[in-house]
Interface confidence: medium
């Protein structure tokens, strides 16, 4: 059989072959970061010759060339330095404005290894127009310099650069430009996952969020759409399984889609998910018309059942047909619900297209997009009802122009991306949905992305302190109530002197609240068993604080979910008739349950809660603690069944000042408080002035470290008595 020659090495890089040296095999070059391959690929033709795509000649020796970033073509009302034809990776460009103009955006930008500039477009603006000066991104040329209501500006890119974003923008009545900022990029450039996740996530959480659309802050540029709890979202996942997608990459497409589905169902909104795989023809694996499209297990199951081999007979990339099948699905649903009904008109639609290349058959996918926009009646007023995300994976044959044409264009948002590989895609989907943008009191939502602050990761976490030093920690369980430990209040009851420090996005120090009332468990008495030789006893170590004002929900302040409540039931996605026992069985379902608490410095530390037989062996070392319990005969006199036990294996131990803080678990991307830090046999912060320092117990310590946490499942009567009007409790 014919095979292609093997003299295809690339100097300074590597290559992979899709099907060895046989005809039909695709050779893909790759280079170290900061370099790009030229040519990017070759195809082994049936004649046994390598064909190099497009402009490059087949005989060209493959080389790794340095990535460069585009230079500014023009910069209005200011100057930039240095003035180069293009800029090397790591190179900077600086901007300054003429007198009377204020610089908006980044004064200094650096060329990154992916051929993209960091920061934001620099604009010198005097604030004269109805809309702000839209600026000119690096490498672009703008025509139109009037910024009044109805004025239009047009953009094109200098030679060899590709425009993404809107080529034309209009100044709207609300003082905002239509569409999205145009960016000129090198054809070989791609996006880093850490840029895509927040951009995609911001846009997506706007669709799921519930905030005031007029509030535009730096960290969440763009509109935020109201999806009421009664609202509905149709999510259409389109997965490319054409020949150029390897089977392994298709698996990662599926995995990424699963992550997306899992995350989307963790919002308390009504969602239907369609799954369509496509090559030459689309295959609908789940339709939004199917009642199962609302059931996460069914959706995940149909994703898992998606087979790479489903498309082995037709291996082209027919993006038009895939989008057209979405259109047909919409059309069927519209007929079913009635075009004029609210039920149809209030559905929001999001399409996520995962592809590795450009469509090469079936006509222009743009036609299908136009049909979709038409059927959904997408106009300026209804722009929020459709979002199309076009994500290209693998720099090889992805067509920037096509992706850009398909992706939605909304101010301050991006909907078209190219990622280097499927690994990067997986990273994006892992971190994209930042549910913490929600402002209602949805519980147990923490920002899990890598760049989130400690307080954003655990926004329920509060510090309780008297006027002097910090003493205890606690957890928000609603917008006005904090759950903590009773022993924090054993030295004096004048709560007017106390403050509760709650996370606040505007201040790294948080915001202080006064306490309206403290409800301390009447059963708590540290000296209750002194006459039995038990110097300290922490039974009923639980307290509630009502804050003087309600806390404004934000990325930094949000309640944790308390088990045995309707709120937690929704977050666990359990059926309506669930009981408190069901929650306990789901959350504390193993002999050793991984859990967390928050350290003095705000970081999340790991412990393992011991259950059943392991609880007994975890607790029994207390008998070796001769200082606190000099003549203890029965461990259960000290460690009652009110306590959870941790401190074995590689567990961290809480420090004295961490008492009252939540002991919590993560399930389905939501957080649930099962206990609160009460007491322990070892203080890892003893003698350490540094908040970041904790010394593990020496391996020879007797007794070994053990930590005991009030088990909230054992405190239900008391919690219900005091929080019955605040939370909706399930039957026991």
């Amino acid at each position: 059989a014919t095979s292609c020659p093997q003299n295809v090495n690339i100097s300074g890089g590597t290559f992979t072959l899709s099907h060895g040296w046989a005809p039909g095999s695709l050779l893909i070059y790759s280079c170290p970061q900061g370099l790009y391959p030229s040519p990017a690929s070759r195809l082994c033709k049936s004649s046994g010759q390598w064909q190099t795509p497009r402009a490059t000649r087949s005989l060209t020796k493959a080389v790794c060339k340095p990535v460069r970033c585009p230079a500014p073509v023009s910069f209005e009302n200011g100057i930039y330095t240095p003035r180069l034809g293009s800029y090397p990776v790591g190179g900077n460009v600086s901007f300054e404005c003429e007198d009377g103009f204020i610089l908006r955006g980044s004064p200094v930008r650096q060329c990154r290894p992916n051929g993209m500039w960091d920061g934001e477009t620099a604009v010198c603006d005097n604030g004269a127009g109805h809309c702000p000066n839209p600026g000119i991104s690096l490498g672009a040329v703008r025509t139109g310099s009037r910024f009044g209501h109805g004025d239009k500006v047009r953009y094109r890119c200098s030679s060899n650069l590709v425009l993404t974003g809107s080529a034309e923008r209009e100044c709207q009545g609300n003082g905002v430009w239509s569409g999205t900022e145009p960016i000129c990029r090198q054809p070989y450039s791609y996006d880093f996952p850490e840029d895509v996740a927040p951009a995609l996530g911001t846009s997506f959480s706007h669709m799921l969020g519930a905030t005031n659309p007029t509030q535009r802050t730096k960290e969440s540029l763009g509109r935020k759409i109201q999806i009421q709890r009664s609202g509905h979202l149709n999510l259409y996942l389109l997965l490319d399984s054409s020949q150029s997608v390897s089977e392994n990459d298709f698996l990662i497409f599926k995995e990424s889609a699963s992550l997306m589905v899992d995350r989307i169902f963790s919002f308390e909104i009504n969602v239907s998910v369609a799954i369509i795989t496509f090559a030459s023809e689309p295959k609908v694996l789940m339709s939004v018309l199917n009642v199962n499209s609302r059931d996460i297990t069914e959706v995940i199951s149909s994703l898992e059942n998606a087979k790479y081999k489903d498309h082995e007979n037709g291996t082209g990339t027919n993006t038009y047909a895939a989008l057209n099948s979405v259109y047909l699905m919409m059309n069927n649903q519209m007929q079913l619900l009635g075009m004029k009904t609210m039920a149809w008109q209030e559905i929001r639609h999001a399409i996520i297209l995962l592809t590795d290349g450009k469509s090469n058959m079936g006509g222009s996918p743009k036609t299908a997009v136009d049909q979709i926009r038409e059927i959904l009646n997408i106009n300026q007023k209804r722009n929020d009802y459709l979002d199309i995300y076009a994500i290209g994976v693998g720099k090889l044959d992805v067509d920037w122009r096509e992706l850009n044409e398909l992706g939605s264009k909304k101010d301050g948002e991006r909907h078209a991306f190219i990622l280097q590989d499927t690994k990067a895609l997986h990273q994006v989907f892992e971190h994209m949905l930042d549910v913490s943008k929600l402002t209602d009191t949805i519980c147990g939502v923490g920002n899990m992305s890598a760049n989130a602050s400690d307080q954003e990761r655990t926004p329920w976490h509060v510090t309780i302190k008297p006027k002097s030093q910090e003493t205890c920690r606690g957890a928000l369980i609603s917008d006005q109530w904090v759950l903590t430990a009773a022993h924090c209040f054993r030295d004096g009851n004048d709560h007017s002197l106390w403050r509760v420090n709650v996370g606040d996005p505007k201040s790294q120090w948080g915001k202080e609240f006064l306490i309206e009332k403290a409800v301390i468990s009447p059963g708590f008495d540290v000296f209750a068993k002194k006459n039995q030789g038990i110097l300290e006893f922490y039974g009923d170590d639980i307290a509630l604080l009502k804050l003087a004002q309600k806390v404004k929900m934000s990325t930094h302040a949000r309640p944790i979910c308390l088990p045995c409540t309707m709120e937690a039931n929704l977050a666990l996605r359990r059926p309506q008739g669930s009981t408190c026992r069901d929650h306990e069985n789901e959350l504390l379902n193993k002999q050793s349950v991984p859990a967390h608490f928050v350290a003095l410095n705000g970081s999340k530390l790991n412990i393992n809660l011991k259950m059943g037989v392991e609880w007994t062996s975890c607790a029994e070392v207390v008998s070796q603690e001769k200082t606190m319990f000099p003549n203890l005969t029965d461990v259960r006199e000290v460690v009652t069944d009110q306590f959870l036990c941790s401190g074995t294996q590689e567990d961290e131990s809480p420090c004295k000042g961490e008492s009252g803080g939540a002991v919590f678990l993560e399930r389905r991307f939501r957080f649930f408080q099962v206990g609160l830090v009460s007491w322990g046999l070892y203080n890892p912060c003893l003698g350490s002035a540094d908040k970041n320092s904790r010394k593990r117990a020496p391996r020879s310590k007797v007794p070994p470290p053990r930590d005991f946490h009030i088990n909230l499942f054992r405190m239900q009567p008391w919690l219900r008595q005091h929080l019955g009007d605040v939370l909706n409790f399930l039957p026991l």
């Epitope: 970041n692 010394k695 593990r696 020496p698 020879s700 310590k701």
Partner: antibody, heavy 118, light 111 residues
């Protein structure tokens, strides 16, 4: 004052076993782990393993697992290390060392020279 | 196992001069906010003696010309002004997890 006193020098034939003792005084024996470290002439230090006298739990360097056995007699505050199937390369000074609160070896015995020779 | 590599293997320093010994670990020895790296001095015919614990803490009774620094995988023992009695072999040792390991030792001589 903390003191660790080890047993005297031993000469053994290849294939035999040796048991070195380490008597502790000046602190509560069960409060700290006891470690065993050896040093061949002109060579560096090599950790053999440790024992928690309270629980009699042990941790071994894989290299010695199966050949080294560490035990304690709490009533006389003494730790023991037995090494079996001796070979000539086991000729070394064997030290017991007491761990402190930082898992460092704060106190050392004077050492026991074990010579393996046919 | 965590391999500790000391450098140099030996060095000669004049009295009153500064001596610096490095120890590099193949894996981080940091946990719970502390670096579980310790330094010992050993003179011929004697057992080792603990000088520095947890990377930078001077054991009581040890002269303050000895100091330790470093974090994660790279550590340094410094003798600020060398005295005659400091001629010895110095070892680093980690106790981050089992098995504990020692560096190969650095022999310090007076020039």
């Amino acid at each position: 004052e903390v003191q660790l006193v080890q047993s005297g020098a031993e000469v053994k034939k290849p294939g035999a076993s040796v048991k070195v003792s380490c008597k502790a005084s000046g602190y509560t024996f069960t409060d700290y782990n006891m470690d065993w470290v050896r040093q061949a002439t002109g060579q560096g230090l090599e950790w053999i393993g440790d024992i928690n006298p309270n629980y009699e739990s042990t941790g071994y360097n894989q290299k010695f697992k199966g050949r080294a056995t560490m035990t304690v007699n709490k009533s006389i505050s003494t730790a023991y290390m037995e090494l079996s199937s001796l070979r000539s390369e086991d000729t070394a000074v064997y030290y017991c060392a007491r761990e402190d609160d930082h898992d460092a070896f704060a106190y050392w015995g004077q050492g026991t020279l074990v010579t393996v020779s046919s | 196992d965590n391999v500790l590599t000391q450098s140099p293997d030996s060095l000669a320093v004049s009295l009153g001069e500064r001596a610096t010994i490095s120890c590099r670990a193949s894996k981080s020895v940091r946990t719970s906010g502390y670096n579980y790296m310790h330094w010992y001095q050993q003179k011929p015919g004697q057992p080792p003696k603990l000088l520095i614990y947890l990377a930078s803490n001077l054991k009581s009774g040890v002269p303050d010309r000895f100091s330790g620094s470093g974090s994660g995988t790279d550590f340094t023992l410094t003798i600020s002004s060398l005295q005659a009695e400091d001629a010895a072999t110095y070892y680093c040792q980690h106790s981050r997890e089992l098995p504990y390991t020692f560096g190969q030792g650095t022999k310090l001589e007076i020039k």
